[in-house]
């Protein structure tokens, strides 16, 4: 059974992930972002279901295309280089989803823009955090 300390750690990691995703979304939506139109042409795959931490596998698998899109953006829109930002997210995701069970991600048939993709995972984090508090 999860202890209060492990629940607290999970909550903190989710809050960190949430902040990173929100920072990316804000950087992309920045009205000074000249590459927004181009960035919105990238296709992202959405999970059919995202209700548990194991479903973060679906986010992990999309981190490479996410980095590719961020490489288009001006670096001043973000505090970190895309590679470092994605690396940080990857570390958190790996810790949160755990490596004990191998979960095969199932994707929806429709693709999403980067904005829709980020909003989906922001909602996911907020939802899990709310169940922990």
């Amino acid at each position: 059974a999860p202890t209060s300390s492990s629940t607290k750690k999970t909550q903190l990691q989710l809050e960190h992930l949430l902040l990173d995703l929100q920072m990316i979304l804000n950087g992309i939506n920045n009205y000074k972002n000249p590459k927004l139109t181009r960035m919105l042409t990238f296709k992202f795959y959405m999970p059919k279901k995202a209700t548990e931490l194991k479903h973060l596998q679906c986010l992990e698998e999309e981190l490479k295309p996410l980095e590719e899109v961020l490489n288009l953006a001006q670096s001043k829109n973000f505090h970190l280089r895309p590679r470092d930002l994605i690396s940080n997210i990857n570390v958190i995701v790996l810790e949160l989803k755990g490596s004990e069970t191998t979960f095969m991600c199932e994707y929806a048939d429709e693709t999403a823009t980067i904005v829709e993709f980020l909003n989906r995972w922001i909602t996911f984090c907020q939802s899990i955090i709310s169940t922990l508090t």
Epitope: T41, K43, Y45, E110
Partner: antibody, heavy 122, light 107 residues
Framework: EVQLVQSGAEVKKPGESLKISCKGS????????IGWVRQMPGKGLEWMGI????????RYSPSFQGQVTLSADKSISTAYLRWSSLKASDTAMYYC???????????????WGQGTTVTVSS | DIQMTQSPSSLSASVGDRVTITCQAS??????LNWYQQKPGKAPKLLIY???NLETGVPSRFSGSGSETDFTFTISSLQPEDIATYYC?????????FGPGTKVDIK
């Protein structure tokens, strides 16, 4: 090896329909946009349109919109170019090509099929 | 649509010569430009992407430069196997238009 293999040459009469194919291998076919390019005899290259095989999203050049239809079957890693009623002016070599970056079409085309010759004559 | 023009439309040069082709876009395309080589009876081949990046496996005698509306493609030392038609293509805006091509042959 990343490859696009196109269907063989076609000889058709005006008014007939035709569907030519482009099969991808050696890479994740669904993750890259596929473009189609026309080359009329002795002429230059003309960009026709693109399709994303994962969800069959398409973009057409205004010059080809309504003239041709792009489609894809991701289960067999194949993209298609179709005419419902051919004209003599459709006589050309047609190439399919993969967009280099994947996920977005804003990249150049790096891998090309060998081309399919279409001849339309009465 | 963005119009692409190339010059010259054809050229003859000797083996070992430096060959330069220019490509002009009707509006700013940043560095979103490719150069392709098409040999007779063959499919086009990508040589240069993003105006100046050499595609993997392409000989270093090929190079590209330029940004915005004016671009240059150079073969530093022409070889017999370089006989082909060279096309520029923009991918700043749909539709991704090609230049009319430059036919290169040996004197």
């Amino acid at each position: 090896e990343v490859q696009l293999v196109q269907s063989g040459a076609e000889v058709k009469k005006p008014g007939e329909s035709l569907k030519i194919s482009c099969k991808g291998s050696g890479y994740s076919f669904t993750d890259y946009w596929i473009g189609w390019v026309r080359q009329m005899p002795g002429k230059g290259l003309e960009w026709m349109g693109i399709i994303y095989p994962y969800d069959s999203d398409t973009r057409y050049s205004p010059s080809f919109q309504g003239q041709v239809t792009l489609s894809a079957d991701k289960s067999i890693s194949t993209a298609y170019l179709r005419w419902s009623s051919l004209k003599a002016s459709d006589t050309a070599m047609y190439y399919c090509a993969r967009h280099r970056g994947g996920r977005s079409y804003y990249y150049g085309m790096d891998v090309w099929g060998q081309g399919t010759t279409v001849t339309v004559s009465s | 649509d963005i119009q692409m023009t190339q010059s010259p439309s054809s050229l003859s040069a000797s083996v070992g010569d430096r060959v330069t082709i220019t490509c002009q876009a009707s509006q700013d395309i940043s560095n979103y430009l490719n150069w392709y080589q098409q040999k007779p009876g063959k499919a086009p081949k990508l040589l240069i992407y993003d105006a100046s990046n050499l595609e993997t496996g392409v000989p270093s005698r090929f190079s590209g430069s330029g940004s915005e509306t004016d671009f240059t493609f150079t073969i530093s030392s022409l070889q017999p196997e370089d006989i082909a038609t060279y096309y520029c293509q923009q991918y700043e805006n749909l539709p991704f238009t090609f230049g009319p091509g430059t036919k290169v042959d040996i004197k």
